[in-house]
């Protein structure tokens, strides 16, 4: 056949849908690969063709749009399942073409099973709520386009396995779930089940997301350098190992880049000739505040190294700070035999 622009298998868009529920899947060509939309393509005489490869098969085959009750159908650039079955799992391809033009992309679709408590292999989106920040809401995701605005669905919210009713600080409000004051105890998986009628049938959409309560911007502070500090002195003899930890606490800030770095005599360690190694570790608190530790290590320190300035720097969206380590050469204890000899006038 003639050449077709093949965008390959778009694994970035690993689509997961629940078994026995409706699913509407838009052809990714118009969303991510082409500079025009479906309407423009359609009016230019281009046709959208769908086909698929079953799981564990190599054979591409057309999608059967003649199933009972139109279980699988296509509408504009959307492939519909009403509802899905487990064996719909596979790689789906949408191809846009006419006699002179062809472009196609494939994407994986996985139909997953859930248990009665909504546990499943589904990758869950994470919604971050600020701790003790006033009323915040989450919205039942990815339900647009399933039913017309004239249809009024029923929505039931669950936390884990439990229907949300008479909860202290969590109130269901239709498609929204309101958190009056988010607390750590609100961390968990929340599920909305949307039930709506269509052509005499009842369909359910199940959407689960993870709520993570994080540090509030009103509590956020510039980076805090815990060490080095004024209370600690690194007193070393030449030949000993010098280890200086720089430990920095970063408040959680949405989309902030936290950075820690050392300078030695005002230069980055990479730009100087001494043999320095730096190891970093990162830990997080339950509200996603971050502690970064960078340990500066000089295996065999020289007397020159002990005269240098060692400064730890830290930066976040809240500001930049720096702190110098107190490094000095250990004064050797006086040797008794030498002092005694000097006392007797030896030269």
């Amino acid at each position: 056949s003639e050449r077709c622009d093949d965008w390959g298998l778009d694994t970035m868009r690993q689509i997961q849908v629940f078994e026995d529920e409706p699913a509407r899947i838009k052809c990714p060509l118009f969303e991510h690969f082409l500079k025009f939309n479906y309407s423009t393509a359609h009016s230019a005489g281009l046709t959208l063709i769908w086909y698929w490869t079953r799981q564990d098969r190599d054979l591409e085959e057309p999608i059967n749009f003649r199933l009972p009750e139109n279980r699988i159908s296509k509408e504009k650039d959307v492939l519909w399942f009403r509802p899905t079955l487990l064996n719909d799992t596979g790689n789906y391809t949408c191809m846009l073409r006419n006699t002179t033009y062809c472009s196609k992309v494939a994407f994986p679709l996985e139909v997953v099973q859930k248990d009665s408590c909504f546990n499943s292999p589904m990758k869950l989106p994470v919604h971050k709520l600020y701790i003790e920040y006033g009323i915040q809401r989450i919205t039942c995701p990815n339900v647009d386009g399933y039913f017309p605005s004239s249809v009024k669905p029923t929505i039931t919210w669950y936390m884990g396995c439990y229907k949300i009713q008479n909860f202290n600080n969590v109130i269901p409000e239709g498609m929204n779930l309101s958190f009056l004051i988010a607390l750590i105890s609100n961390n968990g998986n929340y599920t909305c089940v949307v039930t709506y009628p269509e052509n005499g049938r009842t369909f359910h959409l199940t959407r689960t997301l993870t709520v993570k309560v994080v540090g509030s911007p009103k509590n956020a502070v510039p980076p805090v350098i815990h060490s080095p500090n004024d209370h600690v002195v690194y007193e070393k003899e030449p030949g000993e190992e010098l280890l200086i930890p720089c430990t920095v606490y970063f408040s959680f800030l949405m989309d902030s880049r936290n950075e820690v770095w050392w300078t030695i005599d005002g230069k980055k360690p990479d730009d100087i000739t001494i043999d320095v190694t730096i190891n970093e570790s990162i830990s997080h608190s339950r509200t996603e505040d971050e502690t970064r530790t960078q340990i500066l290590s000089i295996k065999k320190v020289t007397s020159e190294d002990l005269k240098r300035s060692y400064v730890c720097h830290a930066r976040s969206a809240k500001g930049e700070v720096a702190k110098a380590a107190k490094v000095k050469q250990k004064v050797p204890a006086p040797r008794y035999t030498v002092e005694l000899a000097c006392g007797f006038g030896a030269t």
Epitope: V224, S227, N229, H231, Y234
Partner: antibody, heavy 123, light 112 residues
Framework: QVQLVQSGAEVKKPGASVKLSCKAS????????MNWVRQAPGQGLEWVGQ????????YYAQKFQGRATLTVDTSTSTAYMELSSLRSEDTAVYYC????????????????WGQGTLLTVSS | DIVLTQSPISLAVFLGQRATISCRAS??????????MHWYQQKAGQPPKLLIK???DLESGVPVRFSGSGSGTDFILNIHPVEVEDIATYYC??????????FGGGTKLEIK
């Protein structure tokens, strides 16, 4: 996870010395202050001192200055407390406890504690 | 040195009721933005366990029935509703500057 495991119970005579150990795991030992706190039978908590393992910097409560010595072995992530010139009033459970890091640059809390070592001083 | 005075020395409350423990410092342990006052729970035969740090911040894994408040010299630990597993001795602790660490004398909580 963070763990502080202390050495076993000790019985000593007055005037003797004792060296208690506290082995840390689950975190970067050299970057956190290690404290020692004691508790006499039926009494409250009393802070002995603290050490910063990366540098060996130490601070002591005035009461223990000169009699308590805090050291570390960074190769085994172990902290030690040596107490000399023991007297019967030193009979207590001795705890090691780590300071935490938080959004403030001082005033640290003690977030992890060892299980304690009972020291009995008796003639 | 800063002295911490806890009151009462012992406290007996009914299950489900509120327990309030007070800690007074001989001088302020607060600075701009925070108070270096912490609360610990110690059950018989166990090491202390950090409950609240910096006067009001609940430590990870501690039930929300524990809360702390106060600044300057006066601090409060509240437990509500009290449960059987809360039977313990509670200590306040300040760490105002290095190296001055002191503890309150403790408050023993019992169930009526």
């Amino acid at each position: 996870q963070v763990q502080l495991v202390q050495s076993g119970a000790e019985v000593k005579k007055p005037g003797a010395s004792v060296k208690l150990s506290c082995k840390a795991s689950g975190y970067i030992f050299i970057t956190y202050w290690m404290n020692w706190v004691r508790q006499a039978p039926g009494q409250g908590l009393e802070w002995v001192g603290q050490i910063f393992p990366a540098s060996g910097t130490t601070y002591y409560a005035q009461k223990f200055q000169g009699r308590a010595t805090l050291t570390v072995d960074t190769s085994t992530s172990t902290a030690y407390m040596e107490l000399s010139s023991l007297r019967s009033e030193d009979t207590a459970v001795y705890y090691c406890a780590r300071t935490d890091f938080y959004r403030y640059d001082g005033g640290y809390a003690l977030d992890y504690w060892g299980q304690g070592t009972l020291l009995t001083v008796s003639s | 040195d800063i002295v911490l005075t806890q009151s009462p020395i012992s406290l007996a409350v009914f299950l489900g009721q509120r327990a309030t423990i007070s800690c007074r410092a001989s001088q302020s342990v607060s600075t701009s933005g925070y108070s270096s006052m912490h609360w610990y729970q110690q059950k018989a035969g166990q090491p202390p366990k950090l409950l609240i740090k910096y006067a009001s911040d609940l430590e990870s894994g501690v039930p929300v029935r524990f809360s702390g408040s106060g600044s300057g010299t006066d601090f409060i630990l509240n437990i509500h509703p009290v449960e059987v597993e809360d039977i313990a001795t509670y200590y306040c602790h300040h760490s105002w500057g290095i190296p001055m660490y002191t503890f309150g004398g403790g408050t023993k909580l019992e169930i009526k």
